[in-house]
């Protein structure tokens, strides 16, 4: 729990450099996100494909989309879960991180120092050991997050099943109902290829209790979709006289010393025809 208060932002006096004053874990061990670069990567043959169970949500069901002042969050059902980790991890919510229209590079994790346009996090909790995500969030092995790197490219109809509701959650505290859809459609191709490491929540209280799975391959959304995400939302309540745009809601990469990130894929460079001369 924070030492006092719970106000934090991505910019200004309450920005990430100040998080550790109120949330000590933010200045502690195993912090996320990180840069994924070749020196720290190690292939691990035991990292088998994950199975995504109960991800196909019925459109007859309603799911709550919320502007929490930091991101846009979609509540997920507890019978949606990942199979293939040491315990069952049940879904609790997904949310996104992004940049701004002038610098649309707002992913949290970077690859070889490069940001992607945005990043999706699907948060799960260890439901074998804990009754809910809140209880699990500060416990060892408590959380497992799937991270999807998002790049600008072609229109993505699956992501639009979230983005089409953004106008109803423009301000902090606003909530809307979203019809269920297949959450697996938000994942990239070849989900068997991923990075794995132990880290933390990327927002306060920054608990170092997250088993991260960052998929190697990005998904694409269109420039228009990205712009909608970057311009639709505010961090402030509707009646706030000083509205703040919800932009650049990503944490800087953290130190990652004397540790490894494990990959489910071997780092084989594909030779192109041009590279053979």
């Amino acid at each position: 729990a924070p030492v006092n208060g719970s106000k934090w932002t991505y910019f200004g006096p309450d920005g990430e450099n100040s998080w550790s004053k109120k949330y000590p874990s933010c200045g502690g061990l195993l912090q996320s996100p990180i840069d994924l670069h070749s020196d720290i990567l190690q292939y691990d043959a035991s990292l088998t494909p994950l199975e995504f169970q109960g991800y196909n949500l019925s459109a007859n069901k309603q799911f709550l989309l919320t502007n929490n002042g930091h991101s846009v969050k979609l509540n997920l059902p507890s019978d949606m879960h990942i199979q293939g980790l040491q315990s069952r991890y049940s879904a609790t919510q997904l949310h996104l991180h992004w940049g701004n229209p002038n610098d649309p590079h707002g992913s949290e994790h970077t690859v070889s120092g490069q940001h992607f346009a945005a990043e999706l996090h699907i948060v799960h909790y260890n439901s074998d050991l804990y009754p809910d995500a809140s209880t699990a969030s500060n416990k060892s092995e408590g959380l497992a997050v799937l991270a999807v790197l998002i790049e600008m490219g072609s229109f993505n109809p699956s992501y639009d099943k979230i983005f089409s509701h953004l106008q109803h959650v423009k301000y902090k505290g606003q909530e809307a109902f979203v019809p269920g859809f297949n959450i697996e459609e938000l994942l990239p191709e070849r989900t068997a290829e991923y990075y794995r490491y132990r880290g933390s929540l990327t927002t306060p209280p920054c608990n170092p209790t997250v088993l991260w799975t960052v998929f190697r391959n990005p998904v694409q959304i269109s420039q228009e979709q990205l712009l909608a995400l970057e311009t639709a939302l505010y961090c402030t309540h509707m009646d706030d006289p000083s509205p703040r745009e919800m932009i650049n809601n990503f944490r800087q990469v953290q130190k990652f010393d004397e540790r490894l990130v494990y990959t489910s894929f071997s780092q084989v460079q594909v030779c192109t025809a041009a590279g053979l001369s």
């Epitope: 069901k61 309603q62 507890s78 109803h168 109902f177």
Partner: antibody, heavy 121, light 106 residues
Framework: EVQLVESGGGLVQPGGSLRLSCAAS????????IYWVRQAPGKGLEWVGY????????TYNQKFKGRATISVDKSKNTAYLQMNSLRAEDTAVYYC??????????????WGQGTLVTVSS | DIQMTQSPSSLSASVGDRVTITCRAS?????MHWYQQKPGKAPKPWIY???SLVSGVPSRFSGSGSGTDFTLTISSLQPEDFATYYC?????????FGQGTKVEIK
């Protein structure tokens, strides 16, 4: 035939609690959420909350959070609404209802007959 | 919360009259739904997605509108249409209903 049947209404003392039941039949119970909606005498309709019978996940109207609890017994195809600290203003007909998706959003296609709760000393 | 204001609250009309009920939302909504309720009975779905009639609803009923302003129209009022009509939005949490419009016999 798809049916929802409420029961459990009656006279309750102020400060007391109620537990209403909503028994469903005629469809695959876990495929649809169950909503509770109430209607005070001569007034409009007000949503209380809903439950997903497949997993017991609940969502409430903020107005009723902490005072209303919705639960489910899948083996009986029955949802329950418990409300505590009742006041005269909670006097209403309580309906359960099922929303169906039609391609963009939902509408309530099936309603129970309603059960009247009167809060009075 | 999105407030839904129906007007008029009640109206008296004769059989054969054209009747229009308005529902105004305090913020923009994607679709409006309408329900019909008769005394002592549960509401019945009547119009969904602003303009689609529920199966069995006579074609003299129609719905239209967008954004914040929506209407339900009965082109030629029939005796069985005397009831209370409620609008409802599902765009934002909490989902909300209008206060109702009672259509009475003149």
């Amino acid at each position: 035939e798809v049916q929802l049947v409420e029961s459990g209404g009656g006279l309750v003392q102020p400060g007391g609690s109620l537990r209403l039941s909503c028994a469903a039949s005629g469809y695959s119970y876990t495929d649809y959420n169950i909503y509770w909606v109430r209607q005070a005498p001569g007034k409009g309709l007000e949503w209380v909350g809903y439950i997903d019978p497949a997993n017991g996940d609940t969502t409430y109207n903020q107005k009723f959070k902490g005072r209303a609890t919705i639960s489910v017994d899948k083996s009986k195809n029955t949802a329950y609404l418990q409300m505590n600290s009742l006041r005269a203003e909670d006097t209403a007909v309580y309906y359960c209802s099922r929303p169906i998706y039609y391609g963009a959003y939902w509408y309530f296609d099936v309603w129970g007959q309603g059960t009247l709760v009167t809060v009075s000393s | 919360d999105i407030q839904m204001t129906q007007s008029p609250s009640s109206l008296s009309a004769s059989v054969g009259d054209r009747v229009t009920i308005t529902c105004r939302a305090s913020s923009s909504v994607t679709y409006m739904h309408w329900y019909q309720q008769k005394p002592g009975k549960a509401p019945k779905p009547w119009i969904y997605a602003t303009s689609s009639l529920v199966s069995g609803v006579p074609s003299r009923f129609s719905g239209s509108g967008s954004g914040t302003d929506f209407t339900l129209t009965i082109s030629s009022l029939q005796p069985e249409d005397f009831a209370t009509y409620y609008c409802q939005q599902w765009s934002s949490n909490p989902l909300t209903f209008g206060q109702g419009t009672k259509v009475e016999i003149k």
